[in-house]
Interface confidence: medium
């Protein structure tokens, strides 16, 4: 995710870690593959020094990704002091909401919304359809509670996954000229 | 007349590296996304990777995924595949097509043989 | 083995009404992606036939005609002739993978006589 230009928190009363984390996956950065299942799991947010639930698309990703809270805690938070501080990190806002607009390849014209970093506010924007990425929301109400207002729990992420019925533009796609036109 | 010639396939070693080239003309090329698809002999369509008119959203079958890299010179109207780290299961013959509709690749090139083979 | 499913071959005489199926599933047609149908003639490059499921772009004949409904899609050519002898494939968009676009496994249509 970028991080400039946003809110951080500050650093103060930071402890290194008491020795090496005897795992070193422990140390990756959360990795939700590029799979598009919706799966709740938890990794080790080696900034927060703290285990965190997160996405996972169901394949490929890393080995910081444990199914219980328990079990990544177990391999991973045993071997970092508590902060008395968070570290500088972005505040409560998933990855995806960084990611820039990507309206993916295909030529459907659906209105969505996604996270602006540079103005810091959900635009609309027009989506193709297929491909793209996760900072691309149905609803402007949706993209600003998952990513204006640091989120929370994610509530209607699931959304995301769900395919949109294409609307075509007015007169179809460049070049071609339709038989018959067709609306979903 | 859209046209879409593809260049760059020939016979290769397991391991080794080609960059495929497709040139396109007739058709205002940096307003279309643009794909790569390919057919191993006897067999049918694979649709390999794609980018974005600008070139700067790319994407990529799992099969490909880390060994090929998509790109594009839209001041040459020119699209690349480069390939590394190729394997017996990469021969095919490599169309590009540029997405016009929908999801659709409504032009193709007419392809070049890739043939991985010691 | 292919994410959409079709028959691998199919066989009519001129003149004769065939239909070609592609089933999906919920991650693809199913979840309401498009379908494309591409026709390809012995040793050439694919052919866009129909797209955004029922939609022909210029040049092609209205003999052929597709639809979709719920995980399936559906190509059909009236009026068969000679020169439709080929093989078809049906496209489409799955969000199960990682945002790929899949295709059917193709199916060979060979015309009688």
């Known amino acids: 995710a970028a991080e400039e230009d946003e809110e951080f928190t500050n650093i103060t009363d930071i402890k290194p870690p008491l020795q090496k984390p005897t795992h070193s996956f422990c140390a990756m950065k959360v990795d939700d593959g590029p799979c598009r299942a919706y799966i709740k799991r938890f990794f080790f947010n080696i900034l927060t020094h703290q285990c965190e639930e997160f996405i996972y698309g169901g394949c490929e990703g890393n080995e910081n990704r444990f199914e219980s809270l328990e079990e990544c805690k177990e391999k991973c938070a045993r071997d970092y002091p508590k902060m008395t501080t968070k570290l500088t990190f972005q505040k409560g806002k998933p990855d995806f909401c960084f990611l820039e607009e990507d309206p993916g390849i295909c030529r459907g014209y659906i209105t969505r919304y996604f996270y602006n970093n540079q103005s810091k506010q959900c635009e609309r924007f027009k989506y193709g359809g297929c491909l793209g990425n996760l900072n691309n929301f149905e609803s402007l109400e949706e993209c600003k509670n998952t990513c204006e207002n640091g989120g929370g729990s994610g509530g209607g992420l699931n959304d995301i996954f769900e395919a949109q019925k294409i609307e075509w533009h007015e007169g179809g796609p460049p070049h071609h000229h339709h038989h018959h036109h067709h609306h979903h | 007349e859209v046209q879409l010639v593809e260049s760059g396939g020939g016979l290769v070693q397991p391991g080794g590296s080609l960059r495929l080239s497709c040139a396109a003309s007739g058709f205002t090329f940096s307003s279309y996304a643009m794909s790569w698809v390919r057919q191993a002999p006897g067999k049918g369509l694979e649709w390999v990777s794609a980018i974005s008119g600008s070139g700067g959203s790319t994407y990529y079958a799992d099969s490909v995924k880390g060994r090929f890299t998509i790109s594009r010179d839209n001041s040459k109207n020119t699209l690349y595949l480069q390939m590394n780290s190729l394997r017996a299961e990469d021969t095919a013959v490599y169309y590009c097509?540029?997405?016009?509709?929908?999801?659709?690749?409504?032009?193709w090139g007419q392809g070049t043989l890739v043939t991985v083979s010691s | 083995q292919s994410v959409l499913t079709q028959p691998p071959s199919l066989s009519g005489a001129p003149g004769q009404r065939v239909t070609i199926s592609c089933t999906g599933s919920s991650s693809n047609l199913g979840a309401d992606y498009d379908v494309q149908w591409y026709q390809q003639l012995p040793g050439t490059a694919p052919k866009l036939l129909i797209f955004?499921?029922?939609n022909r772009p210029s040049g092609v004949p209205d003999r052929f005609s597709g639809s979709r409904s719920g995980t399936s899609a559906s190509l059909a050519i009236t009026g068969l002739q000679a020169e439709d002898e080929a093989n078809y494939y049906c496209q489409s968009y799955d969000r199960s993978l990682s945002g790929s676009m899949v295709f059917g496994g193709g199916t060979k249509l060979t015309v009688l006589g």
């Open positions: 955004g499921n029922n």
């Open positions: 097509a540029n997405n016009g509709a929908a999801a659709a690749w409504d032009y």
